[in-house]
């Protein structure tokens, strides 16, 4: 059987606060638990939801949570069902409401000496106790002329007189808390001798030098007095006017007229009515001088045909608030249609090319008028004047590809080469009209080019193929001076390209034929075994039908390549001694020797007194110092080749002889002794 371990119990709860109805069950098998409220299943909400088997309330609601709750446990397999005891909330609450007139039925029926009953519509549970206030002052029960009925929440004034006039409010408190009336009641019982407002002055905005009129009227029995004051409390009468209100006139009916208004007249004007009895009534009105500021500038706008666009006109600051309207071609825009004004906005629906032009936003008030133009361009899709054409461009010369289009606004043109955007550099230049210039055409410029012309309305594109007309040229040009090693095999290459594959041949510059051991194999001059006689001037000639021939002159030198007779050795020298690094090279032409020390060439003219290079190439360093240590490279070179060899130099401190060592003891390492 299903057994309840914990059952829900009835309890006090506070409106809007948390609460929990507990329910715990024990059963032989699994059960599912649900809750009923007045017999209907409870649906989970964020406010009220099942928490395990219990029912949790995040905020108790006196309307939704009133009724009987019951916890039901069901074994869905067997169908067995058990129900808990019923539980309900005693919800404590208090809710504000207005003060209303209960008697008489309407305010119009309130007369002096009648009974007036007000009701305080604050409700709650438990029933709260009520406190009444007139003009913020508490009314205690039992005072003369009024009674308070807490049960009916009423305040009765009998009889009601002018002294009862005022703002009535109420507050109530209970165990739950406190609330005060959400809307208060103003009781106004006229005393004929009290001044009453008939006509109150209104704030006025006038343009400079215009006139302003304030109306003010009171009534009472006997008739009340009326007085006008300006800001500084100076009375204004037709007999005594303040210096800055010389043009003020007070009429018999109480109206005040100000003519030729100046900035110093702006401010607060007070109209004071005083009856035979009762307090003075002070009414205020402000005189403002009309003003209007300048309008901000519009940025030119570019729109596309067929779209809908809006341009907002921010009205300038001004008093009174300036009115705003749009004009086009001197005609005010309507408030509906295709091109119209909506609020402060200019609306262009389904834009046409003909809508382009200058639109003017006008703003005006009493102080004047301001205007600002906005230039609207209706963008069109570019059209072709001249598309790029498939072109043959000559190598080495400038080449041009046209992309001439027209549109509004002026279209922007970009070029692509093999689908890659061309950025302007020393080789490419895009002219203002869209033409692409290739400054010096190269063979690999032969490819596809595409130009795209765009405006905000859209873009067009076209492509053209460039074929480069190759010039007849050596690729690469042969070196004008070349060396061949004596008694060795040698080759001198010569190759060329052109629009047609050129034929290449070699000849001696003097026109004599090549010896039999020298062959010309498809442009490569081949020497089986170089002799001294092979030296001299040779010409490589490349030719084809359409482009003629080109020549390259080469001076061949026969040389014995450089070898070192003496190479510098690894050397260690005592500090302050002299180091000698020997180097001797041979070859034809006779090689020159240069030294490099510590990664810089040692210039013989700037060596200073400690260093010297001999004719035979040896390097001597006197009075060596530790900073002279390092690698020294001997470089031998002539007009045909260059060779180098290197050795390290170590500079060490001279050891102090120990007593055990004789004066003739050898040094601990190989030294140059000087």
């Amino acid at each position: 059987a299903i057994v309840f371990i914990k059952q829900p119990s009835s309890q006090d709860a506070l409106q809007g606060r948390r609460a929990l109805l507990r329910c715990e069950v024990e059963a032989p098998g699994p059960v599912h638990v649900y809750w009923l409220l007045d017999g209907a299943p409870v649906q989970d909400t964020e406010r009220r939801f099942a928490q395990g088997s219990s029912l949790s309330f995040a905020a108790v609601d006196r309307l939704q949570d009133s009724g009987t709750f019951q916890c039901v446990a069901r074994d869905d397999v067997t169908g067995e069902e058990a129900r808990s005891a019923n539980a309900s909330f005693n919800i404590k609450w208090i809710e504000a409401g207005p003060v209303v007139l209960k008697h008489p039925a309407s305010e119009a029926e309130i007369q002096p000496q009648t009974q007036v009953t007000l009701r305080c519509h604050i409700d709650g549970h438990p029933r709260p106790t009520y406190q009444w206030f007139r003009d913020g002052t508490p009314l205690s029960d039992g005072q003369s002329n009024h009674t308070v009925s807490s049960k009916e929440r009423n305040l009765t004034l009998r009889p009601a007189g002018p002294e009862h006039s005022g703002l009535y409010s109420c507050c109530a408190h209970s165990a739950f808390g406190q609330a005060c009336s959400s809307q208060n009641f103003t009781l106004s019982i006229a005393d004929e001798s009290f001044a009453r407002v008939v006509l109150a002055p209104q704030d006025v905005v006038v343009a400079r030098y215009e006139e302003a009129m304030f109306h003010c009227q009171f009534s009472a029995q006997p008739p009340p007095s009326l007085q006008w004051l300006f800001e500084d409390e100076t009375p204004i009468t037709n007999r005594s006017r303040p210096p800055h209100l010389r043009r003020a006139t007070v009429f018999a009916n109480g109206s005040l007229l100000l003519t030729q208004v100046r900035p110093r007249n702006a401010g607060i004007y007070r109209c004071i009515g005083q009856g035979q009895r009762g307090p003075p009534i002070i009414l205020e009105a402000t005189l403002h001088l009309a003003e209007i500021e300048d309008m901000p500038l519009f940025e030119p706008r570019v729109f596309t045909a067929g779209s809908e666009e809006r341009v907002t006109c921010l009205p300038p600051k001004g008093l009174p608030e300036p009115s705003v309207w749009w004009e086009h071609a001197g005609v005010r825009l309507p408030t509906h249609g295709r091109v119209y004004q909506k609020g402060h906005e200019l609306v262009l629906a389904n834009i046409a090319e003909s809508d382009a032009g200058v639109y003017t936003c006008h703003a005006a008030n009493l102080a004047g008028q301001r205007r600002q133009d906005v230039n609207i361009t209706v963008a069109t899709v570019p059209s072709w004047l001249k598309k790029p054409q498939d072109s043959q461009l000559e190598e080495g010369k400038p080449g041009y590809l046209d992309c001439l289009t027209q549109a509004t606004p002026k279209p922007t043109v970009v070029w692509y080469r093999n689908q890659m955007l061309i950025s302007e550099d020393s080789r490419f230049e895009v002219f203002k009209n869209g033409t692409l210039r290739i400054n010096s055409v190269e063979v690999y410029d032969g490819t596809w080019y595409r130009c795209m012309s765009s405006t905000p309305a859209g873009s067009i594109e076209a492509q053209a193929r460039v074929q480069v007309l190759e010039k007849l040229k050596f690729t690469p040009p042969p070196q004008p001076q070349q060396c061949m090693e004596f008694d060795k095999e040698a080759t001198v290459p010569c190759s060329a390209t052109g629009r047609e594959k050129p034929t290449i041949k070699w000849e001696r510059a003097d026109g004599s034929s090549l010896p039999e051991w020298v062959t010309d194999n498809a442009g490569t001059l081949h020497f089986a075994r170089v002799t001294r006689d092979d030296a001299g001037n040779y010409t490589c000639i490349a030719s084809n039908g359409p482009q003629g021939q080109i020549r390259a002159h080469v001076q061949l030198t026969v040389a014995v390549f450089i070898t070192f007779k003496v190479e510098p050795e690894r050397t260690t020298v005592y500090q302050g001694h002299t180091a000698l690094l020997q180097c001797e090279a041979q070859g034809d032409p006779k090689p020159l020797i240069q030294w490099k020390g510590k990664d810089r060439i040692l210039d013989p003219t700037k060596l200073g007194p400690r260093m010297h290079i001999f004719q035979n190439g040896s390097l001597v360093i006197h009075d060596v110092a530790p900073e002279d240590s390092g690698r020294y490279t001997c470089i031998a070179g002539n007009s045909c080749n260059i060779k180098h060899t290197e050795a390290p130099l170590y500079v060490v401190d001279k050891p102090v002889p120990e007593e055990s060592e004789g004066p003739g003891s050898p040094p601990p390492y190989k030294m140059i002794q000087t």
């Epitope: 699994p30 599912h32 649900y34 017999g39 299943p41 649906q43 989970d44 039901v72 069901r74 074994d75 869905d76 397999v77 067997t78 169908g79 067995e80 069902e81 058990a82 129900r83």
Partner: antibody, heavy 112, light 110 residues
Framework: EVQLVESGGGLVQPGGSLRLSCTAS????????MNWVRQAPGKGLEWVGI???????YYASWAKGRFTISRDTSKNTVYLQMNSLRAEDTAVYFC??????WGQGTLVTVSS | EIVMTQSPSTLSASVGDRVIITCQSS????????LAWYQQKPGKAPKLLIY???NLASGVPSRFSGSGSGAEFTLTISSLQPDDFATYYC??????????FGQGTKLTVL
């Protein structure tokens, strides 16, 4: 022995009414829930409604208005009152206690 | 209106096969677990297999198992036996004492 026996099925004309009974033995209806489920020929199971231990009833949306579940605890019997019957109400009607205990079913045929 | 969708509607399998039937509800079941599976053979009343999503009813072989939560559930038969060829139904319970069945899955011999 705990068991359920349905009765009251038979042939009824369209627009007619029929009351099915489900007599329980071996347990009390006052602390159990009872379901009615139907199955049209060759079709799937369709839940009709439930009566809980307190006698409150709940129905499938299609059954509301035409079908009424009630009980008589003194006779330990649950009823299914069916009004304004249509051809598509032809089915075997089962009563079931919870999920486990089912009756053998009774056939209702609605035909002219 | 609550809709429970079983898939597949029909399923052919062989003895020894592992079979999975899914049941999807248009809204979450009560407590995310109030779901049962039934087996029905022609001319018989349905027989309870699984209750509260994954609990095995008494006398039901352990090759039957259930899983899932909220609105998606599965019935698994780990190794199909000759006696298992039948029609299977899922049934969900919902807030407000409302119940609904799936349209059924007919399991036949391949």
């Amino acid at each position: 022995e705990v068991q359920l026996v349905e009765s009251g099925g038979g042939l009824v004309q369209p627009g007619g009414s029929l009351r099915l009974s489900c007599t329980a033995s071996g347990f009390s209806l006052s602390n159990h829930v009872m379901n009615w489920v139907r199955q049209a020929p060759g079709k799937g199971l369709e839940w009709v409604g439930i009566i809980d231990s307190s006698g409150s009833t709940y129905y499938a949306s299609w059954a509301k208005g035409r079908f009424t579940i009630s009980r008589d605890t003194s006779k330990n019997t649950v009823y299914l009152q069916m009004n304004s019957l249509r051809a598509e109400d032809t089915a075997v009607y089962f009563c079931a206690r919870g999920l486990y205990l089912w009756g053998q079913g009774t056939l209702v045929t609605v035909s002219s | 209106e609550i809709v429970m969708t079983q898939s597949p509607s029909t399923l052919s399998a062989s003895v020894g096969d592992r079979v999975i039937i899914t049941c999807q509800s248009s809204q979450s079941v009560y407590n995310n677990n109030l779901l049962a599976w039934y087996q029905q053979k022609p001319g018989k009343a349905p027989k309870l297999l699984i209750y509260y999503t994954s609990n095995l009813a008494s006398g039901v072989p352990s090759r039957f198992s259930g899983s899932g939560s909220g609105a998606e559930f599965t019935l698994t038969i780990s190794s199909l036996q000759p006696d298992d060829f039948a029609t299977y139904y899922c049934q969900g319970g919902y807030n407000g004492n409302i119940y609904a069945f799936g349209q059924g899955t007919k399991l036949t011999v391949l």
